[in-house]
């Protein structure tokens, strides 16, 4: 139906609520205003996240899922909007908030860092790898001596509590290790990590953090690096790292160090072989490292360098790194 030309009055949504549905995850819900007269027009909603980080977006449905840290609290607003004649009509805002959890800021952990790593899995006959998670943190400066910390991660719909902690000299948990996780190393979901705590003396403030997998995934070094000299040609080959990513998903760097003159050559490539023209009177050490290429996911970390392979003068046969 056509809208009348006279001024349309848009009313704000009602029953706007914020519900925590998981670790670092909230569900925003609201209802159309029952007194809104124009029921048959295409009303939309503008959602504005006020804290902890500003964001806004539009939606036609009356709920929205948000992945966000919650230790600073969470505040959001929603309003009814209508596009009309190239202009935007909008109602006033309806707002709701979650208060920050109790506890002095100095009691929560600091410097929470996490890394994922892909390892061989002896139990799976189809997917021969598994993803482990390792997190470390520092005890809060104002945390009482009897503070104990507990870590949880959420990936997708799975939340798991740490079972393997490392402790400091006072017995406080300062690191966690998950040998097997539900993390998809090729996935795009955020990894949410929460560290909460308890003490007899004061409330320990929880701390949560979101990690992008590409930024924390520690790639394994390339496997089976070999180097061989034939005349003035140094031929280097290797295999892709232990990884869920297929062979075409890797960039490599080869480092060739001339032990005689100290010259360092670093070459970047997408194949798993490299030939360099060299001075056959020298001794060389060769290393290779890998990173997942931007063809397969966002740029991330380089692996450690492989163990050095020594070739050249004083070498009677090529060495192989297993």
């Amino acid at each position: 139906d056509l809208l009348p030309d006279d001024k349309i009055s848009l009313l704000p949504p009602v029953n706007f609520t914020i519900k925590v549905t998981g670790l670092a995850q909230v569900l925003l819900r609201w209802e159309p205003n029952p007194d809104q007269e124009q029921r048959n027009v295409n009303l939309e909603y503008q959602v504005k996240i006020n804290a902890p980080k500003e964001d806004d977006y539009e939606t036609r449905i009356t709920e929205s899922k948000c992945v966000t840290i919650l230790h600073k609290g969470f505040s959001a607003s929603v309003r009814t909007i209508l596009q009309k004649d190239h202009s935007l009509l909008a109602s006033s805002w309806a707002s709701a908030e979650l208060h920050a959890p109790p506890g002095s800021p100095g009691t929560s952990v600091v410097n929470l860092t996490c890394t994922t790593n892909t390892t061989a899995d002896n139990y799976s006959y189809l997917r021969p790898y598994q993803v482990s998670l390792h997190c470390t943190w520092l005890v809060g400066t104002d945390a009482p001596e009897d503070t104990q910390y507990f870590l949880y991660y959420r990936y997708g719909s799975w939340t798991e509590e740490c079972q393997e902690y490392s402790k400091d000299s006072m017995g406080r948990n300062i690191a966690c290790w998950f040998p097997r996780t539900f993390i998809h190393s090729r996935g795009r979901d955020w990894l949410a990590v929460l560290v909460n705590g308890s003490s007899k003396h004061s409330a320990i403030k929880p701390f949560d953090q979101l990690f992008a997998l590409h930024a924390i995934d520690q790639i394994n070094p390339p496997l089976n690096v070999t180097a061989e000299i034939k005349g003035t040609r140094l031929s280097i080959q290797w295999e892709k790292p232990v990884s869920a990513f297929p062979i075409h998903c890797f960039d490599y760097e080869v480092k060739i160090h001339n032990a005689r003159n100290g010259y360092l050559q670093i070459e970047k490539m997408m194949t798993n072989a490299f030939i360099s023209i060299i001075d056959d009177l020298s001794k060389y050490d060769v290393q290779v490292r890998a990173a997942v290429s931007s063809m397969c996911r966002e740029a991330g970390l380089w692996s450690e360098w492989s163990q050095p392979i020594y070739v050249g003068k004083d070498e009677h046969k090529p060495l192989r790194q297993w």
Partner: antibody
């Protein structure tokens, strides 16, 4: 060789309860996440629930959330599904299956033969 | 509506090639999530046929292959045989669903006599 064998199905009235079991053998049960998948008569597959290897973390489809509880006893190599407040639409063959994640989208690599649950008055 | 859409039925003669489509959306296949395929012969439990888009478990003939593009996936069967008559299901991960596991509705493959 992986073997999964379900039991505990039967006829139950709407609102009633039933507990399904799945006995596992041929693999290290305590190292695997496990799940239940069901199939209503003449219909497709529907994932119901899953549980992690240690039994401390669980997941449910919206259709059964709050009514069904998945659990496991690693000492007995057994997976369970406690079904309460049963409805006619829960009538199905219930399969026990491993829930293999290992870095990617979970898949169901091994299945039991299924046990039939009929909810009818 | 979240989910994966498959044709209810397909049919072909022995020796022919047949494909079964699995259409998704941005919240599942379109986000790059892996697709798996299962075969269910009437009266038996499902069996994993293809995992991670295009990988076959040992024992699955190379007549079966999977592919994926955009928001859709396909299962191809070449050199069709009578014993391939079964229901076929695709399965993936959907970020909009509770639990995230999603199956297609299934496709009945009939091998014409």
């Amino acid at each position: 060789q992986v073997t999964l064998k379900e039991s505990g199905g039967g006829l139950v009235q709407p609102g009633g309860s039933l507990r399904l079991s799945c006995a596992a053998s041929g693999f290290t049960f305590s190292n695997y996440a496990m799940s239940w998948v069901r199939q209503a008569p003449g219909k497709g597959l529907e994932w119901v629930s899953a549980i992690n290897s240690g039994g401390k973390s669980t997941n449910y489809a919206d259709s059964v959330k709050g009514r069904f509880t998945i659990s496991r006893d690693n000492a007995k190599n057994t997976l369970y599904l406690q079904m309460n407040s049963l409805r006619a639409e829960d009538t199905a063959v219930y399969y026990c299956a491993d829930y293999a994640t290992n870095y990617g989208v979970p898949y169901f690599g091994s299945w039991g033969q299924g046990t039939t649950v009929t909810v009818s008055s | 509506q979240a989910g994966l859409t498959q044709p209810p039925s397909v049919s072909a003669a022995p020796g022919q090639r047949v494909t079964i489509s699995c259409s998704g959306s941005r919240s599942n296949i379109g986000s790059g999530y892996d697709v798996h395929w299962y075969q269910q012969v009437p009266g038996t439990a499902p069996k994993l046929l293809i995992f991670d888009d295009n990988n076959r478990p040992s024992g699955v003939p190379d007549r079966f292959s999977g592919s994926k593009s955009g928001t859709s996936a396909s299962l191809a069967i070449t050199g069709l045989q009578a014993e391939d008559e079964a229901d076929y299901y695709c399965q993936s991960y959907d970020s909009s669903l509770s639990g995230h596991v999603v199956f297609g509705g299934g496709t009945k493959l009939t091998v014409l006599r």
